[in-house]
Interface confidence: medium
Amino acid sequence: VEVQVSEDPVVALVDTDATLRCSFSPEPGFSLAQLNLIWQLTDTKQLVHSFTEGRDQGSAYSNRTALFPDLLVQGNASLRLQRVRVTDEGSYTCFVSIQDFDSAAVSLQVAAPYSKPSMTLEPNKDLRPGNMVTITCSSYQGYPEAEVFWKDGQGVPLTGNVTTSQMANERGLFDVHSVLRVVLGANGTYSCLVRNPVLQQDAHGSVTITGQPLTF
């Protein structure tokens, strides 16, 4: 028996359902009584879901997995993972045994889009050209880690005096805070771009300083 899975990682958004595709080619006369199907975490060998002795043995992994029972006889051994969490990310191995056995691994990449950045300025009043200001760009609840880019009003990258930190919350999602320290010109726009490298999603924020008032 030959097992086939998708070579590319499966990308799933947090809190959505994902299908880890796995298939095999049943011989003529194949019946489910002959099938032993096991899904497990590749690294730890933890059992995720199994079908043995002619029946679905159910989820061994937080009760969020399911097979496609009506499609098993056609060779579809795919696994449905519901309400995906960050902690589900990783490699899953599909083992199929009929008379002989084969296995293959499929990777699950979890992702979550970042919120539109909020911009704060310190100090935020009595600003004059030549003043040193701190601009903070904050974006929330994304996954995986963000890449953060700063640009001035002419689109020139600002790389000096930038400090970016990322904090994982209880769900494993990241809040990103990027701080730019810059000397004010006569006026200017400062933009921050927060990029999710898996989703290729960009979230933009900017602040324009033209004396008073400030524009966000």
Epitope: E89, P144, T164
Partner: antibody, heavy 120, light 108 residues
């Protein structure tokens, strides 16, 4: 079996450059976050730089602008390019694998380390 | 940056005794804390992660507890191979990942 083997350490003068390598086996390097952690003689552990599975790079403030982390997925190797070396960079440099692509950033596997000595 | 402070710096005990090592974080890191053991001339070895979970192959005499800012590694009935330096590490707020300064457990 997961294995990490560092190489490229040696003795250099202040201001010079050095590139460290970490050959990984038993796992795919772009499926995990991998870091460089150093330990100065008789001192504690200091995280230096890391790269996530998705390719996002991180640096400690003490090396930002001087060190560059990279990886070659085709030969499953991690690198640390160290420029403008200083005496305080003298340490054993360990390559360490996180147990996840990103966020669970504790280190479940470590190499044996390679010694970098910066001295005039 | 989250600063981790380990105490005591050195713990002098006899085999069979219980070792209690402390790690304090400068702000809450929930339960995102790991413990490592390091012997002279060797790389660190993961003991505990997520504050309480023992890594693969780590004996049951090692246990972790705590949350927020106060964490403890307990070694029940010290064996000769347990005399080493122990480091805590946080992975909640980063970069940078930060380590404590270490506690040396030495034989009395």
């Amino acid at each position: 079996d997961v294995q990490l083997v560092e190489s490229g350490g040696g003795v250099v003068r202040p201001g010079e450059s050095l590139t460290l390598s970490c050959a990984a086996s038993g796992f795919t390097i772009n499926s995990y976050a991998v870091s460089w952690v150093r330990q100065a003689p008789g001192e504690g552990l200091e995280w230096v730089s890391g790269i996530s599975g998705s390719g996002v790079r991180y640096y400690a403030d003490s090396v930002k602008g001087r060190f560059t982390i990279s990886r070659d997925n085709s030969n499953n190797t991690l690198y640390l390019q160290m420029n403008s070396l200083r005496a305080e960079d003298t340490a054993v440099y360990y390559c360490a694998r996180s147990n996840k692509v990103t966020w669970n950033n504790f280190f479940d596997y470590w190499g044996l380390g390679t010694l970098v000595t910066v001295s005039s | 940056e989250v600063v981790l402070t380990q105490s005591p710096g050195t713990l002098t005990l006899s085999p069979g005794e219980r070792a209690t090592l402390s790690c304090r974080a400068s702000r809450s890191i929930l339960t995102s804390l790991a413990w490592y053991q390091q012997k002279p001339g060797q790389a660190p070895r993961l003991l505990i992660y997520n504050t309480v979970t023992r890594a693969t192959g780590i004996p049951a005499r090692f246990s972790g507890s705590g949350s927020g800012t106060e964490f403890t590694l307990t070694i029940n009935s010290l064996q000769s191979e347990d005399f080493a330096v122990y480091y805590c590490q946080q992975y909640y707020d980063w970069p940078p990942l930060t380590f404590g300064g270490g506690t040396k457990v030495e034989i009395k």
